[in-house]
C-alpha cells in the first residue's frame, strides 16, 4: 500500500527573467528513492538517480540547474514557463508518487508564493 | 568501522581474465553502491562503473564495456569485478568503493588489488 | 565526459605553509565536486564534498572553495601527514571523472 505523500511548493508566480526554485518533499513512507524525474506538461526537464546523479535534458540546459536537494532551479524566465510541472518520485517498493507545481511568470512586478499544499 | 576489503594481487597472462573480490563490513551492504576505480601507473584515477547491491542495477563507463563485468553477492556482502581479454594496458590497481543514496561521491574507498598483465 | 583539468600537477611545500590546488571543470558542474587525499601506496580518502562540505573526521585546515567550473582546495598551515596527492572529482552525472592529480611533496 502506499502510504506517502508528497508536499509540494504548490501554486507559485515568479517575475519574467528571474528565477525560480521548484521543490517536493516525500514523506509519509520508508520506501527508497531511487529517481526523481522532472516534466513540464510532457517535456522531461531533468533525472536525478540515486547512483547516476543528475542529467539534465540539452535543451533545458541553458536555464535549468539541478538543486537544491533532489529540487530543481529555473532561471531566467518567460512568460511561456507558465503552466504544470511534475515531480515524479520513483520509489521502493511503493512505486511512483506524482507532485504538481504550478507556476505563473508575471510580468509585473508583483510575484506572490502561493501556500503549500500536499498530494497523496 | 567501515571496511572494504579486496583480495590479493594477480598476475594473470595476456587474453585471461581475473575477478576481483571487494567484500564490507561494518555497515548494511545494500545501503550503499559500489563503484570500481582503475589507477594506472599510480597516476589519475578511472571510474570504471557502479553496482547497487540492493536492486542489482548497474552502469558503465563507456570505456570499461566489455572489458568489465560488475557482480554482487548480498549474502556474502561482497561485489566482484571481472576483467576480460586482459592486456598490459589493463595493468593497474583496481579499487572499489562506496556512495550513498543521491551522495555521488566516495565516502570509503577498498584496499585496493594490483593487477599485473604479463607473459 | 566532463573533462576535470588540476593544477598544479605538482608542487613542494614545507610544514607550516598554506598551499592552494585548484580544479577547472569542462562544464558547469555547479557545487558537485569532491577532493581525495592519496597517500603512496594507499587508497584515496574523501577530504571534501559538495565543494566545500568536510566529513566527519577531516581536519579542519582543510577547506573548499568554489562552484561552476573553478573550484580550489587549500590546506593551511601544512602538516607532515598532509604531503601525499590530491585529486578532484565531480559528482554531477556519470560517467563521474578524475583530475590528473596534485602530488604535493616536502620542500
Known amino acids: 500500500m502506499m502510504t506517502g505523500t508528497i508536499e509540494t511548493t504548490g501554486n507559485i508566480s515568479a517575475e519574467k527573467g528571474g528565477s525560480i526554485i521548484l521543490q517536493c518533499h516525500l514523506s509519509s513512507t520508508t520506501a527508497q528513492v531511487t529517481q526523481v524525474n522532472w516534466e513540464q506538461q510532457d517535456q522531461l526537464l531533468a533525472i536525478c538517480n540515486a547512483d547516476l546523479g543528475w542529467h539534465i535534458s540539452p535543451s533545458f540546459k541553458d536555464r535549468v540547474a539541478p538543486g537544491p536537494g533532489l529540487g530543481l532551479t529555473l532561471q531566467s524566465l518567460t512568460v511561456n514557463d507558465t503552466g504544470e510541472y511534475f515531480c515524479i518520485y520513483h520509489t521502493y517498493p511503493d512505486g511512483t508518487y506524482t507532485g504538481r507545481i504550478f507556476l505563473e511568470v508575471l510580468e509585473s512586478s508583483v510575484a506572490e508564493h502561493g501556500a503549500r499544499f500536499q498530494i497523496p | 568501522e567501515f571496511q572494504l576489503q579486496q583480495s590479493g594481487p594477480e598476475l594473470v597472462k595476456p587474453g585471461a581474465s581475473v575477478k576481483i573480490s571487494c567484500r564490507a563490513s561494518g555497515y548494511s551492504f545494500t545501503a550503499y553502491s559500489i563503484n570500481w576505480v582503475q589507477q594506472t601507473n599510480g597516476k589519475s584515477l578511472e571510474w570504471i562503473g557502479v553496482i547497487n547491491p540492493k536492486f542489482g542495477t548497474i552502469n558503465y563507463n563507456q570505456k570499461f564495456k566489455g572489458k568489465a563485468t560488475l557482480t554482487v553477492d548480498q549474502s556474502s556482502s561482497a561485489a566482484y569485478m571481472q576483467l576480460n581479454s586482459l592486456t598490459s594496458e589493463d595493468s593497474a590497481v583496481y579499487f572499489c568503493?562506496?556512495?550513498?543514496?543521491?551522495?555521488?561521491?566516495?565516502?570509503?574507498w577498498g584496499t585496493g588489488t594490483t593487477v599485473t598483465v604479463s607473459s | 565526459d566532463i573533462q576535470m583539468t588540476q593544477s598544479p600537477a605538482s608542487l613542494s611545500a614545507s610544514v607550516g605553509e598554506t598551499v592552494t590546488i585548484t580544479c577547472r571543470a569542462g562544464?558547469?558542474?555547479?557545487?558537485?565536486l569532491a577532493w581525495y587525499q592519496q597517500k603512496q601506496g594507499k587508497s584515496p580518502q574523501l577530504l571534501v564534498y559538495n565543494a566545500k562540505t568536510l566529513p566527519e573526521g577531516v581536519p579542519s585546515r582543510f577547506s573548499g572553495s568554489g562552484s561552476g567550473t573553478q573550484f580550489s582546495l587549500k590546506i593551511n598551515s601544512l602538516q607532515s601527514e598532509d604531503f601525499g596527492s590530491y585529486y578532484c572529482?565531480?559528482?554531477?552525472?556519470?560517467?563521474?571523472?578524475f583530475g590528473g592529480g596534485t602530488k604535493l611533496e616536502i620542500k
Open positions: 568503493a562506496r556512495n550513498g543514496n543521491f551522495a555521488w561521491y566516495f565516502d570509503v
Open positions: 562544464e558547469n558542474i555547479y557545487s558537485y
Open positions: 572529482q565531480h559528482h554531477y552525472g556519470v560517467p563521474w571523472t
